[in-house]
């Protein structure tokens, strides 16, 4: 707000007033009269820059008159009262209402006093964020989508992630005239390491008190990545039972595990239990390559592990034994 005048009457008003599309807004405007100063106000006038004529007038004897009587109203000016408050209410804000307005007091003996106010017409956008489910492609593809619908002015969208990625942002007119829908895609080369990770879409708009943060949980569909664990290269005759685990990461989840060897079916000492393979104690050395084949909706992948059960002094090793 401009500082009060010293020794002269001054019109006080904010330089800018925000209002929301479809809502009502008050353009505040007051005449500040210093203590020792005397003034008589006979008319209050509102005019819009670039338009001919005044949109609202409050006349000392004629009262209020409006260019659009259903959309405008002096909020405080009354016949028979001192005219010090020219604040004007506008109803059903439209995009075309945005602009510069002059509030003017016709005073005696000081003359006319006026101030300009910029009316900003805003529309609060609706924001959504969604995952774009992708498969391994080897090239950058949109993995998340953030949409800010019907904002005025257009919302600002940024992405926050420690995965890298590049935004691709575009705008189209919104459903309501003068509004804008902003769509931002977050683009990255899909990999299994990205699956299940989060990225955050940050939407900023002058109608928000603080930015809106929308989290997207990324989805990458990929065939199983398979490894076998549980073998430490240190198996000896006389050991207890041991278990191998077929470790598979995939999206969607594995639908089946199949254990075999390079020679064909499993030997008797190996018993398949889903993702696990139970190795029973043996009484003679073995050297076998085991295969775990994992299937999901996108295909099958396998891992191989060569297992040796060696002879060794039982006193030094726990060994695989029948007990």
């Amino acid at each position: 707000w401009p500082p009060p005048g010293t020794g002269d009457v001054v019109v006080q008003a904010p330089t800018q007033v925000p209002g929301f599309l479809g809502d009502s807004v008050t353009l505040p405007c007051y005449l500040q009269v210093p203590n020792m100063e005397v003034t008589h106000v006979s008319q209050l006038t509102w005019a819009r820059h670039g338009e001919s004529g005044s949109m609202a007038v409050f006349h000392q004897t004629q009262g209020p008159s409006y260019s659009e009587s259903k959309r405008l109203e002096f909020v405080a000016a009354r016949l028979g009262a001192e005219l010090r408050n020219a604040s004007l209410r506008m109803f059903g804000l439209r995009v075309e209402d945005e602009g510069n307005y002059t509030c003017l007091f016709v005073t005696f003996p000081q003359g006319s006093r006026s101030v300009d106010i910029w009316l900003r017409v805003l529309a609060k956008p609706q924001n959504t964020a969604e995952v774009q489910k992708v498969q391994l492609t080897g090239e950058p593809v949109p993995m998340a989508r953030c949409v800010s619908t019907g904002g005025r002015p257009p919302a600002q969208i940024t992405w926050h992630s420690d995965l890298g990625g590049m935004p691709n942002t575009s705008q189209v007119p919104g459903f309501l005239s003068g509004t804008v829908t902003v769509t931002s895609l977050w683009i990255l080369v899909p990999s299994s390491q990205v699956d299940g990770k989060n990225v955050t879409c940050k939407v900023e708009h002058e109608s928000f008190e603080k930015p809106q943060l929308l989290t997207v949980n990324l989805t990458v569909y990929y065939p199983p990545e398979v490894s076998i664990s549980g073998y430490d290269n240190n198996w000896y005759l006389g050991q207890n039972e041991a278990t191998l685990t077929c470790d598979a990461r995939s999206n969607p989840e594995p639908t089946g595990y199949n254990w075999s060897t390079t020679m064909g079916p499993l030997p008797p000492f190996a018993v398949a239990q889903g993702a696990q393979l139970l190795i029973r104690p043996v009484d003679k050395p073995i050297n076998t390559t085991l295969i775990c084949n994992v299937t999901n909706a996108l295909g099958a992948r396998q891992a191989e592990l060569t297992v040796q059960v060696k002879e060794g002094p039982p006193s030094e090793h726990s060994g695989i034994s029948r007990n």
Epitope: H40, P109, S112
Partner: antibody
Framework: EVQLVQSGSELKKPGASVKISCKTS????????MHWVRQPHGKGLEWIGG????????SYNQRFKGRVTLTVDKSTSTAYMELSSLRSEDTAVYYC?????????WGQGTLVTVSS | DIVMTQSPSAMSASVGDRVTITCKAS??????VAWYQQKPGQPPKALIY???YRYSGVPDRFTGSGSGTDFTLTISSLQAEDLAEYFC?????????FGQGTKLEIK
């Protein structure tokens, strides 16, 4: 009904002064500024100045400053305009007019003739 | 001082005609313009304030328009009783000034 009734015609010699009255009725005198406008015969209108009855605040056209004095008598709701050092070119009809930014009510006019 | 230049200075028109009087201000006066009608032997009568708003009781055939420096008074259908002189006036700043007048005669 708002009425502004002015005093009668005046014939004055050059160098003299004239004081015209404007008695008001039908509204609250102190709520409106009173202004004075003159019109030479067959010519346009010229604003002289105005006074607010409540505060006594005045505004004058610089062309008349020093020669014109505006006063009011709140007790009788009457405004006065005195013009001194009259010259022949001051011959005109003088109007009081109630100010609402524009002038919504006017007196009937007082003809002042300055002639030697 | 702000100069208000009115045109034409005189005109004659027939009953039923559309009549337009213009007033040009030497500087921007916003919408702080009034129009007056003065019949012979009478004081001026206020018609329009704030450039485009009619005083109550003024026939709607009288229309004011404009802002800034260019203003117009239009009589949409001239009546015999509209025989008068018409003045514009600015009240944007002191000293208040009037146009020189437009004398309207009926043919």
């Amino acid at each position: 009904e708002v009425q502004l009734v002015q005093s009668g015609s005046e014939l004055k010699k050059p160098g003299a002064s004239v004081k015209i009255s404007c008695k008001t009725s039908g509204y609250t005198f102190t709520e409106y500024t009173m202004h004075w406008v003159r019109q030479p015969h067959g010519k346009g209108l010229e604003w002289i100045g105005g006074i607010h009855p409540n505060s006594g605040g005045t505004s004058y056209n610089q062309r008349f400053k020093g020669r014109v004095t505006l006063t009011v008598d709140k007790s009788t709701s009457t405004a006065y305009m005195e013009l001194s050092s009259l010259r022949s070119e001051d011959t005109a009809v003088y109007y009081c007019a109630r100010w609402t930014g524009d002038f919504d009510y006017w007196g009937q006019g007082t003809l002042v003739t300055v002639s030697s | 001082d702000i100069v208000m230049t009115q045109s034409p200075s005189a005109m004659s028109a027939s009953v039923g005609d559309r009549v337009t009087i213009t007033c040009k201000a030497s500087q921007n006066v916003g919408t702080n313009v009034a129009w007056y009608q003065q019949k012979p032997g009478q004081p001026p009568k206020a018609l329009i304030y704030s450039a485009s708003y009619r005083y109550s009781g003024v026939p709607d055939r009288f229309t004011g328009s404009g802002s800034g420096t260019d203003f117009t008074l239009t009589i949409s259908s001239l009546q015999a009783e509209d025989l008068a002189e018409y003045f514009c006036q600015q009240y944007q700043s002191y000293p208040y000034t009037f146009g020189q007048g437009t004398k309207l005669e009926i043919k």
